[in-house]
Interface confidence: low
């Protein structure tokens, strides 16, 4: 059989807080358990959810959790069930509510002398008790003829006068909890002797130096006062003002002009009228200086004929919101047609090449007017002027391509050499028209060349065929000074290039012939076996018909090539002592000798106290060092050519002769000895 | 005793940008308005501009308008005048003012020295 | 703008002298809505900031010594010191109070024989 271990009791619960209905069974087999409210079984909800077999409440609901729950226990093999006894929770709340007139019907049938009864909805359980409050400060019962009846909730006036006016709100509170009136009433009983408004002041934007006028009456029996106060609470009176309203005037009938308006004078003004009983009642209204900033500038517009086109007008800021229209030609542009306007936006549909121009937005307010012109421009496709001709250019020489159009905008010019553009450097330039100048021109030049000018309407093109007259000309150039090693075979080549391919012969310079040994073979000169006699100028002579001739002057020199007599040795010196490093060259002319060491030249006349260079070449370091260690390099040169070679030098320390040695123990390296 | 309290000067570049203040105290500050002045070396007054209590209204001599900002914060009694692309001509005392409400200027600060120089 | 002009430039006169300075603006500082004239007078001695002396044209400011007298009307003011003392050596400016931009005049020298 299934036994209730726990069975829920009915409880107190608060509204919004956590609460249980337990139950626990006992029973032979397995059983599942549930809940039901009001004969209906419980879904499990995050606020309403089964905890084992009880039941948890996070946060009770005083509408979805008001009957009767019972836990049922039910053993699903044998069908057999059991049900635990009822229990309901005794739920307590407070809600706010509103303040509302229950009598009479309506606010307009409120009159002074009739009862007024309002009441408080304020709910709750267990019944709440009520407060009630005009304008904050508590009433309490049978005090100036009102009665509260805390039964009903109701405040009733009986009979209602001008003393009664107010902002009425009420409180209640129970076990639970307290809660006040989410909406308030306010009671409004018309007193002659309470200032009410008649005109109330509005708000005024002038421009400066301006005139503005604020109207302001309240009427009331005996007529109520009326006073003006300006943004800080200063007063203003016909008598007594601030410096920045020395130009208001208050008129009797309580209006406050204000003339030759500035800055100083932009602000909150208020209107206060004063009965001779009841509150004062305080209008205000602002002041404000009309305004208009500039307007930003418009890029100038290209557009091409046929299509459609916006261009969109920024307002200037601007106090009150500035106006804006276009105009073109001095004429303010349609709402409607091909060319108009549109909100803030100048329209142009299926644009024509008449369309073109400079239109004006212009805004204003009471503060001015700001214009700012657009120029817009309709592109037209290019037309040619001249197309680029086929050329012939002479190498060396400027040469120049035409490509001249034109268009509105100007047309842009580009130039391509065998399809690559070509970008402005040293040789190339572009000039403003279009043209083309090729600098100097060089053979490699002769190629198709093509230009292409554009606007935003179209571009067309045009090619032409550069070729390029060559110049007669030493390719290359002879060296004009060479030297040929005596008693040995030697040539010297000259060759050239023209529109025609050259003929080239050599002659000395003297106008002598060549020696039988010596022999002219198509530009080049020949030395079988080089003698002394054969020092001297010569000439190439290069011809073509068209081009004439051109002559290059050589002197050749007959030298023994240099060859070295004495190379500097790898050597090895203690620190302290001298260095010696021998070289010596021969050759015709005699040659120089130089010594590099550690990469730089050693320069004979700044070489120091330590080194030393002989008349034959040898180099001297004195009393060296560590630093001294390194590569040096032999260089002998004369005019004809130049040789080096090289050779280490390391400088160790001298090593501390142990007992053993005697005296004339050898080192232990091959040295130089000082 | 009213006192008013200018800082923030200095040597400044060419184009460069500085923002002065001015420290109020012994009176109201928060329903006067303020002025600044400047006098450069040698030379006489020169009205920068003015704000009204609750910064709502603020006027600026015409040629100034576009290099200085002046705002203020209440609750910090501070008047301020931030300067940018200043000038060699720029080089001055600067002093901040309370208006009279009967007219004129009738307290001011020492000044805050400003030398726009490279 | 309106444009401050003060007259002379600098004056030099032996204490107990009365000694008089002009200003003239270049439009009415007259106010129509109090019939006051909307002009200024500060005092500004060596190495300190000017002292507002005079406001409405003629009112002087409270602690300022009545030897200090301001007068004129529309577009024509002076100040007059009716009897100089060694502590009135200052530069002496009149001010538009009247329209922005609030101008001053370029100032007047006393100097103390």
């Known amino acids: 059989a299934i036994v209730f271990i726990k069975q829920p009791s009915s409880q107190d619960a608060l509204q919004g807080r956590r609460a249980l209905l337990r139950c626990e069974v006992e029973a032979p087999g397995p059983v599942h358990v549930y809940w039901l409210l009001d004969g209906a079984p419980v879904q499990d909800t995050e606020r309403r959810f089964a905890q084992g077999s009880s039941l948890s409440f996070a946060a009770v609901d005083r509408l979805q959790d008001s009957g009767t729950f019972q836990c049922v226990a039910r053993d699903d093999v044998t069908g057999e069930e059991a049900r635990s006894a009822n229990a309901s929770f005794n739920i307590k709340w407070i809600e706010a509510g509103p303040v509302v007139l229950k009598h009479p019907a309506s606010e307009a049938e409120i009159q002074p002398q009739t009862q007024v009864t309002l009441r408080c909805h304020i709910d709750g359980h267990p019944r709440p008790t009520y407060q009630w409050f005009r304008d904050g400060t508590p009433l309490s019962d049978g005090q100036s003829n009102h009665t509260v009846s805390s039964k009903e909730r109701n405040l009733t006036l009986r009979p209602a006068g001008p003393e009664h006016s107010g902002l009425y709100s009420c409180c209640a509170h129970s076990a639970f909890g307290q809660a006040c009136s989410s909406q308030n009433f306010t009671l409004s009983i018309a007193d002659e002797s309470f200032a009410r408004v008649v005109l109330a002041p509005q708000d005024v934007v002038v421009a400066r130096y301006e005139e503005a006028m604020f109207h302001c009456q309240f009427s009331a029996q005996p007529p109520p006062s009326l006073q003006w106060l300006f943004e800080d609470e200063t007063p203003i009176t016909n008598r007594s003002r601030p410096p920045h309203l020395r130009r208001a005037t208050v008129f009797a009938n309580g209006s406050l002009l204000l003339t030759q308006v500035r800055p100083r004078n932009a602000g909150i003004y208020r209107c206060i009228g004063q009965g001779q009983r009841g509150p004062p009642i305080i209008l205000e209204a602002t002041l404000h200086l009309a305004e208009i900033e500039d307007m930003p500038l418009f890029e100038p517009r290209v557009f091409t004929a046929g299509s459609e086109e916006r261009v969109t007008c920024l307002p200037p800021k601007g106090l009150p919101e500035p106006s804006v229209w276009w105009e073109h030609a001095g004429v303010r542009l349609p709402t409607h047609g091909r060319v108009y306007q549109k909100g803030h936006e100048l329209v142009l549909a299926n644009i024509a090449e008449s369309d073109a121009g400079v239109y004006t937005c212009h805004a204003a307010n009471l503060a001015g007017q700001r214009r700012q012109d657009v120029n817009i421009t309709v592109a037209t496709v290019p037309s040619w002027l001249k197309k680029p001709q086929d050329s012939q250019l002479e190498e060396g020489k400027p040469g120049y391509l035409d490509c001249l159009t034109q268009a509105t905008p100007k047309p842009t010019v580009v130039w391509y050499r065998n399809q690559m553009l070509i970008s402005e450097d040293s040789r190339f330039e572009v000039f403003k028209n279009g043209t083309l100048r090729i600098n100097s021109v060089e053979v490699y030049d002769g190629t198709w060349y093509r230009c292409m000018s554009s606007t935003p309407a179209g571009s067309i093109e045009a090619q032409a065929r550069v070729q390029v007259l060559e110049k007669l000309k030493f390719t290359p150039p002879p060296q004009p000074q060479q030297c040929m090693e005596f008693d040995k075979e030697a040539t010297v080549p000259c060759s050239a290039t023209g529109r025609e391919k050259p003929t080239i012969k050599w002659e000395r310079a003297d106008g002598s012939s060549l020696p039988e040994w010596v022999t002219d073979n198509a530009g080049t000169l020949h030395f079988a076996r080089v003698t002394r006699d054969d020092a001297g100028n010569y000439t190439c002579i290069a011809s073509n018909g068209p081009q004439g001739q051109i002559r290059a002057h050589v002197q050749l020199t007959v030298a023994v090539f240099i060859t070295f007599k004495v190379e500097p040795e790898r050597t090895t010196v203690y620190q302290g002592h001298t260095a010696l490093l021998q070289c010596e060259a021969q050759g015709d002319p005699k040659p120089l000798i130089q010594w590099k060491g550690k990469d730089r030249i050693l320069d004979p006349t700044k070489l120091g106290p330590r080194m030393h260079i002989f008349q034959n070449g040898s180099l001297v370091i004195h009393d060296v060092a560590p630093e001294d260690s390194g590569r040096y390099t032999c260089i002998a040169g004369n005019s004809c050519n130049i040789k080096h070679t090289e050779a280490p030098l390391y400088v160790v320390d001298k090593p501390v002769p142990e007992e053993s040695e005697g005296p004339g123990s050898p080192p232990p390296y091959k040295m130089i000895q000082t | 005793e009213v006192k008013l309290l200018e800082s923030g000067g200095g040597l400044v570049q060419p184009g460069g940008s500085l923002k002065l203040s001015c420290a109020a105290s012994g009176f109201d500050f928060s329903k006067d308005w303020m002025s600044w002045v400047r006098q450069a070396p040698g030379k006489g007054l020169e009205w920068i501009g003015e704000?009204?209590?609750?910064?709502?209204?603020?006027n600026y001599a015409p040629s100034l308008k576009d290099k200085f900002i002046i705002s203020r914060e209440n609750a910090k009694n501070t008047l301020y005048l931030q300067m940018s692309k200043v000038r060699s001509e720029d080089t001055a005392l600067y002093y901040c003012?309370?208006?009279?409400?009967?007219?004129?200027?009738?307290?001011w600060g020492q000044g805050t020295s400003v030398t726009v120089s490279s | 703008d309106i444009v401050m002009t003060q007259s002379p430039s600098s004056l030099s006169v032996s204490a107990g002298e009365k000694v008089t300075m002009s200003c003239k603006s270049s439009q009415s500082l007259l106010n129509g809505g109090n019939q006051q004239n909307s002009l200024a007078w500060y005092q500004q001695k060596p190495g300190q900031p000017p002292k507002l002396l005079i406001y409405?044209?003629?009112t002087r400011e409270s602690g300022v010594p009545d030897r200090f007298t301001g007068s004129g009307s529309g577009t024509d003011f002076a100040l007059t010191i009716s009897s100089v003392q060694a502590e009135d050596l200052a530069v002496y400016y009149c001010q538009n109070d009247h329209t922005y931009p609030y101008t001053f005049g370029g100032g007047t020298e006393l100097e103390i024989k």
């Open positions: 003012a309370r208006w009279d409400y009967d007219g004129g200027m009738d307290y």
């Open positions: 704000i009204n209590p609750d910064s709502r209204t603020i």
């Open positions: 409405g044209a003629s």
